[in-house]
């Protein structure tokens, strides 16, 4: 995941739950028991905003270490900080926990710019606000971190959601969520609603903030509207999906198929923006600058480089563009569009100087690693991460945030022929996919 | 309060090289690009380039590409401008100033004096 | 690049005067024009932004209008404060330019 674009909140948990709605009645095909309805002790269990990631509260060690975790859905690993730094305000401290075991195994992990290193242990981990269990599970102890923690901050470790087959040092660390499912009855699945804001949030703001919830082990109805549409896991090590048609204001972008995909599609909760490879992303901002272009921005702006402001409470959203990403169905030939607004990929940015405004920051960027759909993309929707049937299913967010004139969308089914030729596979090396 | 703390005067000789360091303090530095800026004595102002700390991806004036070089160490919040093959035209004044919407913050600068 | 011109050099005005600071652009740059107040033996200070929004704290007689082209500083009722050298910056396009400079002298 993209650790530079990756920053950190500060604030606390709590926050009532939102009222949940009875189940309804849908079409959509019946799930084992357990895996659906009423998540009550998991909603709001999120701090945060796009720009500065979502963390979960969880608990370590014997006695239980309270730490703030970066929920991470675009890495495998359970780190964190284990030893003092001036980033941090607390950290895990194993030789108070009766439960700790040394793995007696180094790991290192290095990143475009920084990296961290640690020692391989084993505690027990359990999340507050989570399902009511304990488990065993891997724990990276950051003993030496550099351009990792970040001052400011109030987290003080990572939660890697993804595969094992991404951990570090090796696929053989399994990861926490393997270790949930394998030592309790918790299923195979978790989602995801990341609540961005809609306007900055200063730091007393942020402490009272609802952030979303991450619902472990099952579906919470309350946190979406309309219907599920699922895209299968096209390969499980990070949460690789398949994009087959990309729109700006429902024109195509007419590109073949798989540069948007090249080199991998990944849905990626630590990273903030909507990120695309180099071609697309240049096709898709002119595309958007021929929409909007009643008003002249700075190029410095489609670099993300520059703020636009606008008189508080006059930003002109409608003469942006809607976002629509078409995602292979899980039917032949049948695909899906996720379509996002404006108020999702212009990012509320708070500048004492030019406070007597509203600030924005574009939060589309170009990758070199392929497509990332951060948190610019999941703060629209409500996002299944169904490992146990690979696939990750989409819903609008029940708290996106929109106008009256235009909401996110997931609309289907479109038919979408040769949808597997979209994939683009990467030349078997050895993977170093933490350097991005 | 947004603060952005330069290095002091430097008095270099010809040929050489200077690396000017900018401290930024009251925001979160991965958040905003920084520019720098040259001023020679009695004369205007001319912009070097400017850095993303996020992703340290650099954009350079075409007239300073080979002169200036812009890093950052995010763990600190600083931005470094090294100046190489030094002359006496640039001997200067040189701020850095962070973006927002134009550049609403800048250093206090720091001079740099080539002689021999 | 983009070519800020600021024809005068100098301005001569008294306290409690109106001064108008003029900026040409050599492309249309929209509203994406900046004024900039530098005193002397000081770094610059940020006073406009888009042509006409003030940062914050900047007092209201200091006022930016133009698009496209051509803009104006304007200050209204003159303080001694306000001597000091006004610059235009364009940052439509990159490289980002500024303009020469217009000196404030109060009489």
């Known amino acids: 995941t993209q650790h530079g674009i990756r920053l950190p909140l500060r604030s606390g948990l709590g926050g009532a739950p939102l009222g949940l709605r009875l189940p309804r009645e849908t079409d959509e095909e019946p799930e084992e028991p357990g895996r659906r309805g009423s998540f009550v002790e998991m909603v709001d269990n999120l701090r945060g905003k796009s720009g500065q990631g979502y963390y979960v509260e969880m608990t370590v060690g014997s006695p239980p270490q309270t730490l703030n975790i970066l929920v991470d859905t675009g890495s495998s690993n359970f780190a964190v900080g284990a030893a003092p730094h001036p980033f941090l305000h607390r950290y895990y401290q194993r030789q108070l926990s009766s439960t700790y075991r040394d793995l007696r195994k180094g790991v290192y992990v290095p990143y475009t710019q920084g990296k961290w290193e640690g020692e391989l242990g084993t505690d027990l981990v359990s999340i507050p606000h989570g399902p009511n269990v304990t488990v065993r599970a891997n724990i990276a102890a950051i003993t030496e971190s550099d351009k990792f923690f970040i001052n400011g901050s109030n987290w003080e470790g990572i939660l890697g959601l993804a595969y094992a087959e991404i951990a570090r040092p090796d696929d053989s660390l399994e990861p926490f969520f393997d270790s949930l499912v394998k030592q309790t009855h918790v299923p195979n699945l978790f989602s995801l609603q990341l609540c961005g804001a809609g306007f900055p949030l200063n730091q007393s703001e942020v402490l009272a903030s609802v952030g979303g919830s991450m619902i472990i082990g099952g579906i919470d109805h309350s946190l979406y509207t309309g219907s599920l549409w699922y895209t299968p896991i096209r390969r499980e090590w990070y949460y690789e999906v398949i994009i087959v048609r990309v729109e700006i204001n429902g024109q195509d972008l007419k590109m073949d198929c798989k540069e948007y995909n090249y080199d991998k599609s990944i849905v990626d909760s630590g990273t903030t923006n909507l990120r695309l490879p180099k071609k697309v992303f240049e096709a898709a901002v002119k595309s958007i600058k021929a929409a909007s272009s009643t008003e002249k921005f700075p190029d410095g702006f489609w670099l993300g480089e520059q703020l636009v402001c606008w008189q508080a409470g006059t930003t002109p959203w409608n003469i942006f563009p809607v976002i629509s990403l078409y995602l292979m169905g899980e039917v032949t030939n049948q695909s899906f569009r996720i379509t996002i607004l404006p108020q999702q990929y212009l990012r509320p940015v708070e500048d004492v100087a030019t406070s007597q405004d509203d600030c924005y920051k574009f939060a589309i960027s170009q990758s070199s690693t392929g497509t990332v759909m951060g948190a610019v993309i999941m703060e629209g929707f409500y996002v299944v991460f169904d490992r146990a049937r690979k696939r990750i299913g989409f819903a609008v967010s029940a708290c996106h945030v929109h106008d009256e004139f235009r909401t996110a969308a997931v609309e289907g089914p479109f038919v979408t022929l040769d949808m597997e030729d979209c994939g683009y596979n990467i030349p078997q090396t050895d993977e170093s996919t933490l350097m991005t | 309060e947004i603060q952005l703390q330069q290095s002091g005067t430097e008095l270099v000789r010809p040929g050489t090289s200077v690396k000017l360091s900018c401290k930024a303090s009251?925001?979160?530095?991965?958040?905003?690009?920084m520019h720098w800026v040259k001023q020679r004595p009695g004369q205007g102002l001319e912009w070097i380039g400017m850095?993303?700390?996020?992703?340290?991806?650099?954009n350079y004036n075409q007239n300073f590409k080979g002169k200036a070089t812009l890093t950052v160490d995010t763990s600190s919040g600083t931005a470094y401008m090294q100046l190489s093959s030094l002359t006496s035209e640039d001997s200067a004044v040189y701020y850095c100033?962070?973006?927002?919407?134009?550049?609403?913050?800048w250093g206090q600068g720091t001079t740099v004096t080539v002689s021999s | 690049d983009i070519v800020m011109t600021q024809s005068q050099k100098f301005m001569s005005t008294s306290v409690g005067d109106r001064v108008s600071v003029t900026c040409k652009a050599s492309q249309n740059v929209g509203t994406n024009v900046a004024w900039y107040q530098q005193k002397s033996g000081q770094s610059p200070k940020a006073l406009i932004y888009s042509a006409s929004h003030r940062y914050s704290g900047v007092p209201d007689r200091f006022t930016g209008s133009g698009s496209g082209t051509d803009f104006t500083l304007t200050i209204s009722n003159v303080q001694s404060e306000d001597l000091a050298e006004y610059f235009c910056q364009q940052y439509n396009s990159y490289p980002y330019t500024f303009g020469g400079g217009t000196k404030l002298e109060i009489k």
């Open positions: 009251g925001y979160t530095f991965t958040n905003y690009w």
């Open positions: 850095i993303d700390p996020s992703a340290a991806y650099t």
């Open positions: 100033a962070r973006s927002g919407v134009a550049f609403p913050y």
